[in-house]
């Protein structure tokens, strides 16, 4: 049978080759008649066998961490017969461990965040090193952790690598710490290998600082011309905390005049002093207010740091501004009848200088040929007005300070031109009428209507009549419909185209104005040769052709 002991070969041997052990058959009497052979992965490259003796050698440096076990096969042949002396056998060569690997922190970089002011014993982070050596081979992979840097604020548990706080820390003094942890194998004994890692420990902020004003007194100025909502200046408090813990709210603590407000710019953490009501230098030229500042978020357990809010005094000086003239009214509406003579009085506007010096005022009208204004603000006409051309005038009146012509104010002035009855009614359109030669008496020739350019206070009412001469000898008559229309009717039977081809009828139209106005309007009536149906259409057609230069048969 085969004879061998268990085979071990140390890793990382520096020798060119290493005797591992001997394989032999118990039938081998040492006369060199047997030949030993090695087969399997590593045979001939990692391990060789002395064919005569069965001695096995490792011919290359081995690394247990790469491969810890080789399974090989052995054969032994009788040289004289060429036959196997023993059945082929499998055997194992184990690579024994040496402490050739230092502990390594595979999860680095390490970074941890812990709240400032955390009590002693607070867990920060656990660091873990790995050692590639054999954990079952002595202490080659048994690790001990120690702190190389980080005392007195931190400690590390030797066997677990758990880092804890050992002293309270204030982020406002130092916000991060570099801790260096060493891991040693061989449980720290001589010949141990070591590895280190750095842990960045950042302190997160807690709200242990209240905001405090940078200044105990702020001096601000505001122009009396500033509109409400104007930002007149900023005040600033500082808070040693950061982020949400440094967010602050500013507010007014004292402002008897209730003229100012403070809003908080949450981006810059500044307090913005805002004008709540307009100020007037001539009325009050300085103010004093008190502001306070508090954190936006305060945890109950941190209230002890936030007793008594920080306050500051703000002195606000009002700056005098040369203000433009001020009209008594924001706008004026005046009325004047049309047809009044040039130079007629329209109305009076009035503006004053609101400043203390009370500059005299000059007035002017922007782009107007119809009105004039004097230095007293009296508006007069420069022309007679016609309501039927323009019923309203929109004027822009400008007041200018005599002492400072750049100080100007303008207001609108509306002038309504009032109606007088200065227009008689007229035909609403040009009428051309036709009558057949064979027309009977009482036949309607034309319906007419009238218009009046005057404005009617209630409603226009027109009265229609024939002129006196037409009434006495007319072939036609008129009926007033009492609805501002009238009809023209024939007053006889039969007309003669050859004798009287055209009639001109004078129609009087009167309005209901005071005094009443009457106009004379002429209606032209053509006599036509009509067909049996009595239609004037052909007559109208013939008229059209003649007017266009055609002759009809």
């Amino acid at each position: 049978g085969w004879v061998w002991n268990q085979f071990f070969v140390p890793e990382e041997m520096n020798t060119t080759s290493h005797h591992v052990g001997r394989l032999r058959s118990d039938l081998d009497n040492g006369n060199n008649s047997f030949q030993y052979k090695l087969l399997g992965a590593g045979a001939g490259s990692t391990f060789i066998i002395d064919e005569r003796t069965g001695d096995i050698y490792a011919i290359e440096k081995l690394d247990r961490e790469e491969r810890s076990l080789y399974i090989l096969r052995a054969q032994v042949i009788d040289i004289t017969t060429g036959r196997a002396v023993e059945p082929e056998s499998e055997f194992v060569i184990k690579v024994s461990d040496i402490n050739d690997n230092e502990p390594k922190f595979l999860d680095e970089p390490y970074e941890a965040i812990v709240p400032e002011m955390s009590p002693e014993g607070t867990l920060v982070i656990q660091v873990t090193a790995s050692d590639a050596d054999d954990p079952s081979s002595g202490n080659n992979a048994r690790l001990l952790y120690s702190l190389l840097q980080g005392q007195p604020y931190f400690s590390v548990e030797p066997t677990t690598g758990v880092i804890r706080i050992s002293s309270k820390m204030d982020r406002e003094l130092q916000d991060e710490y570099w801790v260096i942890i060493q891991a040693k194998d061989m449980i720290g004994q001589p010949g141990a290998l070591s590895g280190t890692t750095s842990v960045l420990i950042k302190l997160s902020d807690v709200n242990d600082n209240k905001p405090i004003f940078k200044e105990s007194l702020y001096r601000l100025t505001v122009s009396e011309s500033a509109p409400t909502g104007t930002s007149i200046g900023t005040i600033m408090a500082y808070d040693n905390d950061i982020g949400e813990n440094a967010e602050m709210d500013y507010s007014i603590e004292e402002d008897d005049s209730q003229t100012f407000d403070i809003i908080t710019n949450h981006e810059t953490q500044e307090g913005i002093v805002i004008l709540k009501k307009k100020v007037n230098f001539e009325h009050q030229n300085h103010y004093g207010i008190r502001a306070k500042v508090k954190n936006h978020h305060v945890d109950k357990q941190l209230m002890k740091y936030h007793t008594e809010a920080s306050t500051t005094f703000i002195k606000i000086q009002v700056e005098d501004v040369d203000e433009p003239p001020l009209f008594l009214l924001p706008y004026y509406i005046f009325e004047i009848f049309e047809e009044t003579p040039q130079g007629s009085f329209v109305g009076v506007v009035s503006a004053t200088d609101p400043d203390n010096r009370k500059s005299p005022i000059r007035y002017s009208i922007t782009r107007s040929k119809v009105f004039n204004i004097d230095d007293n603000g009296t508006i007069t006409t420069t022309n007679s007005l016609d309501r039927e051309i323009s019923a309203w005038y929109n004027l822009s009146i400008t007041a200018t300070e005599k002492y400072n012509i750049e100080q100007i104010s303008s207001i609108p002035v509306y002038v309504q031109v009032l109606n007088i009855n200065d227009h008689a009614p007229e035909f609403s359109q040009y009428y051309e009428s036709y009558v057949c030669e064979n027309a009977g008496s009482g036949q309607v020739i034309q319906t007419i209507s009238a218009v009046d350019r005057d404005e009617s206070i209630e409603e226009h009412h027109f009265y229609f009549n024939l002129s006196v001469e037409d009434t006495n000898s007319s072939s036609f008559t008129i009926i007033d419909n009492q609805d501002n229309t009238a009809v023209i009717l024939t007053n006889r039977t039969g007309f003669n185209l050859q004798e009287e081809p055209i009639f001109y009828i004078s129609i009087l139209i009167a309005d209901n104005g005071i005094p009443s106005l009457t106009s004379t309007n002429t209606l032209t009536i053509h006599v036509c040769d009509c067909d049996d149906s009595g239609s004037t259409q052909t007559c109208q057609y013939q008229e059209l052709m003649l007017s266009m230069g055609f002759k009809t048969e």
Epitope: T15, T16, G44, S45, I48, T53, Y57, E60
Partner: antibody, heavy 121, light 107 residues
């Protein structure tokens, strides 16, 4: 009978290249380590390089590392030495030598007669 | 690297005399030492390996001894064919290194 026959030597300029061969016979080539050893004129022996049987492992003297490459072709039972960036100090007779058995695996039990390499401008 | 130091550099002896050649290693190389003989114009020839094992065909008058750092090659009775240069070589560590050689000449 084990025999080793070197070839490929010659005169080469500094910076040049040469490839030496060593034809082996009389033994199972793939079962033995093979070596190159050189001897400068009038000097002692200097080991150059070794390759294990089958070519899995190669080793070099510091003086040639990065410039010389040892290799073998088991099918031809031939050992090679590719020499690049040659220097005057590389001038020598280059011998190939067969490794031994067992504990003398990386030994030199049979030597070839050598081939001469001259590096000169 | 292991430095091999041979002494003496030259050994002048007569035929039939005993030759004792020394080889020292700069650190222990166990028994992984070989001795070679080289004659002018010839390739080296293996004499001893494993510090004391004679190679095939080497006569019994040639013997080796020692281990660790101190080694000796002994030729008990010099023959004419023994006059040559002798090199020791360690094969325990990379790089393999040779001694500077000892020349055995006829007195």
């Amino acid at each position: 009978e084990v025999q080793l026959l070197e070839s490929g030597g010659g005169l080469v300029q500094p910076g040049g290249s040469l490839r030496l061969s060593c034809a082996a016979s009389g033994f199972t080539f793939s079962s033995y380590a093979m070596n190159w050893v050189r001897q400068a004129p009038g000097k002692g022996l200097e080991w150059v390089s070794t390759i294990s049987g089958g070519g899995a492992n190669t080793y070099y003297a510091d003086s040639v590392k990065g410039r010389f490459t040892i290799s073998s072709d088991n099918s031809k039972s031939t050992l090679y030495l590719q020499m690049n960036s040659l220097r005057a100090a590389d001038t020598a007779v280059y011998h190939c030598a067969k490794g031994g058995m067992g504990g003398y695996y990386y030994g030199m039990d049979v030597w070839g007669q050598g081939t001469t390499v001259t590096v000169s401008s | 690297e292991i430095v091999m130091t041979q002494s003496p550099v030259t050994l002048s002896l007569s035929l039939g005399e005993r030759a004792t050649l020394s080889c020292r290693a700069s650190q222990s190389i166990s028994s992984n030492l070989a001795w070679f003989q080289q004659k002018p114009g010839q390739a080296p020839r293996l004499l001893i390996y494993g510090a004391f094992t004679r190679a095939t065909g080497i006569p019994a008058r040639v013997s080796g001894s020692g281990s660790g750092t101190e080694f000796t090659l002994t030729i008990s009775s010099l023959q004419s064919e023994d006059f040559a240069v002798y090199y020791c070589q360690q094969y325990n560590y990379w790089p393999l290194t040779f001694g500077g050689g000892t020349k055995v000449e006829i007195k």
